[in-house]
Interface confidence: medium
Amino acid sequence: ELCDDDPPKITHATFKAVAYKEGTMLNCECKRGFRRIKSGSPYMLCTGNSSHSSWDNQCQCTSSAARNTTKQVTPQPEEQKERKTTEMQSQMQLADQVSLPGHCREPPPWENEATERIYHFVVGQTVYYQCVQGYRALHRGPAESVCKMTHGKTRWTQPQLICTGETEPSQFPGEEEPQASPDGLPESETSR
């Protein structure tokens, strides 16, 4: 069962999944100037059996410029910087992936993919939040959100996290000395 909504948004925070439940879909989105190859599926799907899961299909993008043009589309410095970030994230994500039954790990990257990955999560999926650079985390509870089914409708639980700038007041109302806990997740673009 697909989750109806996106996970909750938290100011100055991003979220990501450590592993993706079977049934999760990832759109094959391409960056500007590129489109999905004609024969390509519009998404990758996490599928599997009782013991192993993997992404079915593979995303590929091709230049959307006319075929007979000789002008090459070269990534602009900004695009190159964005791709570099994604590459570093991939390395970090792949380095410490654990194999969870019924889950796929972070999908492989693809050439000229869009800078933001759009996921369609399923019930039971957990996503983890961390504060963006320059902000620190104040936790009331777990910095995670789970897609749950209640009364036939899907909803995401509310993560107990506030991200505060170094100069801002660092306490929840009515609390004394909150402990800023270290963020254990690699930095990531927001997934949807």
Epitope: H52, Q60, L94, P108, P109
Partner: antibody, heavy 122, light 104 residues
């Protein structure tokens, strides 16, 4: 030691089918993608398809969708490729190759099989 | 679909010479891999993600490039380097036509 051992040479008639195998050893077979690559005599390399042995997911080069069928036997750690409706164009050496995308997130063929020679002749 | 063109098709060199072969992509790509193949043998991984040498590859080999142009360089060619070298796009798995390095 990681190895991919492929089956022996095949001489087949036009229109027939042939199945070749690729036996993996030295690693967890179900954790890596197995790719198949074609090389015609004196020619370059052409990627055919991959299969993920853990669950049988496959992904094909469009040019081979109607030509090749991939399967695996997890118990013997063996991947198979069946080629059908053979013509002289299918005469080639076929390699299996293990792929990983752990090299900085990039797909990479890190171990190659010994190759199976297929000759199509009447 | 990305097309990779390798040049030259045949590269003749004397031992100790520096040689460079190129791989051009039909549109910009972020990385390519290189494989070495000797007659009658399977291809071997040689350079991955543009510039990283595979295990056991001598340090005289190097890879570089970006966008649509990539190259493999041998700083001082040795007899054992005689082989065909193929570039491959990391995502579509397309291979170039190969460059045969032969020794004079």
């Amino acid at each position: 030691q990681v190895r991919l051992q492929q089956s022996g040479p095949e001489l087949v008639k036009p229109g027939a089918s042939v199945q070749m195998s690729c036996k993996a050893s030295g690693y967890t077979f179900t954790d890596y993608y197995i790719n198949w690559v074609k090389q015609r005599p004196g020619q370059g390399l052409e990627w055919i398809a991959w299969i993920f042995p853990g669950n049988g997911n496959t992904y094909f080069n469009e040019n081979f969708k109607d030509k090749a069928t991939l399967s695996v036997d997890k118990f013997s750690s063996t991947a198979f490729m069946l080629l059908s409706s053979l013509t002289s164009e299918d005469s080639a050496v076929y390699f299996c190759a293990r792929a990983t995308y752990d090299h900085g997130g990039y797909w990479y063929f890190d171990v190659w099989g010994t190759g199976t020679t297929v000759t199509v002749s009447s | 679909q990305i097309v990779l063109s390798q040049s030259p098709a045949i590269l003749s060199a004397s031992p100790g010479e520096k040689v460079t072969m190129t791989c051009r992509a039909s549109s910009s790509v972020s990385h390519i891999h290189w494989y070495q193949q000797k007659p009658g043998s399977s291809p071997k991984p040689w350079i991955y993600a543009t510039s990283n040498l595979a295990s056991g590859v001598p340090g005289r080999f190097s890879g570089s490039g970006s966008g649509t142009s990539y190259s493999l360089t041998v700083s001082r060619v040795e007899a054992e380097d005689a082989a065909t070298y193929y570039c491959q796009h990391w995502n579509s798995f397309t291979f170039g036509g190969g460059t045969e390095l032969e020794l004079k």
